[in-house]
Interface confidence: low
């Protein structure tokens, strides 16, 4: 055991190079100076170290920087970043966008790991402010990151970032988030033609106002029921039977299967029964024929 702690004669590393891949773990521990490793971190990524060897290198950095790595080292961690725990990353102070990009690149193509989530959190705290370039970077690597932000935070997402968003990335967004994202998507896609526009905007329609749904109903878009069911109830309620029929096109028959669920249930309650009957779907619960319909918002204003 005692011999293993001393570096064998002639094996002391003078630089970080490929010869180190032949070192046993204990030799790396004994023969690689932590300060040398820190100054030549950019070389580590180009050398095919084993995971066990990377563990040793990480241990050396941990000993050198017990309070957390400096940004000069963090920026060049490369695949060693995958060895870091969230606890390690919480000690860091990351302020450079280049550092963030370099580490996100390492994790590119994978789901957001706890390490990445912690890194982004540290970056936000370290910088104090997030400008549009930073947000562009985050959404480029993790479009789904949008749904982890509060509506307040989303308010300054640049419309250009919306282009990177895939439908599945909005699955976890709630209505308040879509309220903010929808107008940005509308702006981002405004120069597309009708059918292409609908394909792109569809995922964001949970934030669309009534006026926009009415406009879409005039464009033969054939919205599917899954999309319709995610629309805001308050945006759907003012739509007429004819508008919903045009909006859904051949998918209108799906209303029968959803008649007990929002927003379909609430919409049915607002329609005249004889209008609903024109759909031929057997939808029940509309306002009986001959009843006077009061505009409740007007009634409140008068009282």
């Amino acid at each position: 055991e005692v011999e293993k702690t001393a570096c064998p004669s002639g094996k002391k590393a003078r630089e970080i190079d490929e010869s180190l891949i032949f070192y046993k773990k204990w030799e790396l521990e004994a023969c690689v100076d932590a300060a040398l490793l820190a100054t030549q971190m950019d070389r580590v990524n180009a050398i095919p170290f084993t995971y066990e060897q990377l563990d040793v290198l990480k241990h050396k950095l941990d000993e050198l920087y017990p309070q957390g790595y400096p940004e000069s080292v963090i920026q060049h961690l490369g695949y060693l970043f995958l060895k870091m725990s969230p606890e390690d990353i919480r000690k860091w102070n990351v302020t450079s966008l280049e550092t963030l990009k370099a580490l996100l690149e390492v994790n590119k193509g994978h789901e957001m790991s706890p390490q990445v989530a912690t890194l982004i959190d540290r970056f936000v705290k370290g910088r104090g402010q997030l400008d549009k370039d930073t947000l562009d970077t985050l959404t480029a690597f993790y479009p789904g990151y949008l749904c982890s932000l509060s509506p307040e935070e989303l308010s300054s997402v640049p419309p250009s970032s919306i282009w990177a968003v895939r439908p599945q990335d909005l699955d976890t967004c709630d209505p308040r988030q879509l309220d903010v994202l929808y107008p940005k998507a509308r702006l981002a896609f405004q120069n597309m033609n009708g059918s292409e526009y609908f394909v792109k905007i569809q995922s964001f329609l949970g934030g669309a106002p009534t006026e926009d749904l009415k406009a879409l109903s005039q464009q033969n878009v054939s919205m599917d029921l899954a999309t319709f069911m995610k629309l805001r109830t308050d945006a759907v309620l003012p739509l007429t039977v004819a508008e919903v029929q045009k909006l859904l096109g051949p998918h209108v028959e799906g209303l029968k299967a959803e008649e007990r669920h929002r927003p379909v249930r609430d919409w049915i309650l607002r329609q005249r029964q004889d209008d609903l009957d024109t759909l031929g779907l057997g939808l029940q619960g509309g306002i009986p024929n001959g009843y006077l319909v009061l505009d409740l918002s007007m009634q409140e204003a008068l009282s």
């Epitope: 308040r176 107008p183 702006l187």
Partner: antibody, heavy 120, light 109 residues
């Protein structure tokens, strides 16, 4: 022609709640293209952003005022409102309501402003 | 918070002359900067946004330039109606925290 009109009491006692309303006419408060904001200006001083609200009710507040602030919208009345609690003399200012395009944080149309004095 | 600093606090220029107003941000705001004009007893009016784009109805004698942290508003030939207080505003931050400069008073020399 869009018009924004602030209304509310011109005098509020310290520790009470300042309440103002902005009425939008000549344009749609429910437009998905705009936020509606409040900015204030103490006498003889510069401008301070208070917060903004979207037609859906989502509101965004200045961090320094967040704990005392509530901004809401009533689309049926074409109005949005400001409530600032626990006021002090430092809240004495001309309060402006303004329109903010959703694609940026600038204010492209302003009301004429209303002076609110906090004094006992 | 991004702090916006305008200089000078007061600028005295004769009508027909050129006026140059400066605005400095404590950190980069990219090109997300607006200029407003405010006359006594009136609300501010948007002049320039995106650093250099004139708002609707603003005369060509008003121009803006700069990027990052240093910005300039230039009025090429001062008219009597241009004498007022000018404010710059950044809208680059996230979460939103829009801040204004303290203002530059442009007065007749």
């Amino acid at each position: 022609q869009l018009q924004l009109q602030e209304s509310g009491p011109g005098l509020v006692k310290p520790s009470e709640t300042l309440s103002l309303t902005c009425t939008v006419s000549g344009g749609s408060i429910s437009s998905s293209s705009y936020y509606w904001g409040w900015i204030r200006q103490p006498p003889g001083k510069g401008l301070e952003w208070i917060g903004s609200v979207y037609y859906s009710g989502s509101a965004f507040y200045s961090p320094s005022l967040k704990s005392r602030l509530n901004i809401a919208v009533d689309t049926s009345k074409k109005q949005f409102s400001l409530k600032l609690s626990s006021v002090t003399a430092a809240d004495t200012a001309v309060y402006y309501c303004a329109r903010r395009p959703y694609k940026s944080g600038l204010f492209d149309f302003w009301g004429q402003g209303t002076l609110v004095t906090v004094s006992s | 918070e991004i702090v916006m600093t305008q200089s000078p606090a007061t600028l005295s220029v004769s009508p027909g002359e050129r006026a140059t107003l400066s605005c400095r941000a404590s950190q980069s705001v990219s090109s997300n900067l607006a200029w407003y004009l405010q006359k006594p007893g009136q609300a501010p009016r948007l002049l320039i946004y995106g650093t250099s784009t004139r708002a609707t109805g603003i005369p060509a004698r008003f121009s803006g330039s700069g990027s990052g942290t240093e910005f300039t508003l230039t009025i090429s030939s001062l008219q009597s109606e241009d004498f007022a207080v000018y404010y710059c505003q950044q809208y680059n931050t996230w979460p939103p925290e829009y801040t204004f400069g303290q203002g530059t008073k442009l007065e007749i020399k």
